[in-house]
Amino acid sequence: QEFHFGPCQVKGVVPQKLWEAFWAVKDTMQAQDNITSARLLQQEVLQNVSDAESCYLVHTLLEFYLKTVFKNYHNRTVEVRTLKSFSTLANNFVLIVSQLQPSQENEMFSIRDSAHRRFLLFRRAFKQLDVEAALTKALGEVDILLTWMQKFYKL
């Protein structure tokens, strides 16, 4: 059982554990999200992503979650259960990112560019909100991310 993001294979990640970690904090995160009209992982970000694109897109999205979302939220929360859940998610995201090596070949430019444009839509939506609201919304949308990642899961 592994993820196949196009040519990028990821082993050793148990989706069940990601879901368990998310569900442990889901109600808290989504209850704190007061901006229900906006969505960061909107349709245009995740719709019809090709296999070739998927490696680039999941790499940039998970790196953003690691460097911006988890890192900043970690400094703002004190509840042990919440920290534990985010640590589980973050550790697994690290494991995924560490195995992703998107091709930097020139012939992949258009695919890389398409994935980057998708990521920019997400980042732009994130930056339009104030920091606290953006972090909360990004964490509350981890289920959208996990659901989309299922497309690339292999039994």
Epitope: P15, Q16, E20, D143, L146, W148
Partner: antibody
Amino acid sequence: ELQLVESGGALVQPGGSLRLSCAASGFTFDDYAMSWVRQAPGKGLEWVSHISGNGRSTFYAESVKGRFTISRDNAKNTLYLQMNSLKSEDTAVYYCAKDDYGSGLYAYWGQGTQVTISS
Amino acid sequence: SYELTQSPSVSVALRQTAKITCGGDNIGSKSAQWYQQKPGQAPVLVIYADSRRPSGIPGRFSGSNSGNTATLTISGAQAEDEADYYCQVWDVSAAVFGGGTHLTVL
């Protein structure tokens, strides 16, 4: 060999209670979320309830919320569905299913157990 | 709540191609599964993650998922493919099944 065996189905009067069991073998039970899915006579599949591998997260269909309780005993490799305040519309074959992703990827199903609610 | 729409029945001539569709709002951003069920039997997973085939499922079964429609295609339908087919996705802490499509092989 992976196996899911449901039991506990019976004929019960409206308003009554029933507890279904699903004995699992051939895989590490607590590593996987599980679900109950039912099928009324001549009808389609209807998801009933879901429980995470550690048992801490549970979800229910609106039609059974407040009446049914899903649980698991990981030491006994067994999934349960406690059904209270049963109605005639709960009549169905109840299947337990192993979730291979944690959010609705049912690669393995039991053979089902018949629940009939009638006076 | 999220809904999936399937046509109740589809007919196909033996060894021809059958297409069964499943409609849902922005279903293309979700992972779609397809199950085959024969009378008196439990469902069997035939396609998962939009287009992947579990081991043991014949190569004539394929799937796609884009926009508002997921599609199960059976290329060169066989008599044993006559069954009910259900699409399914996960949406906000719940599994959702389509109403089912009965495939008749003529």
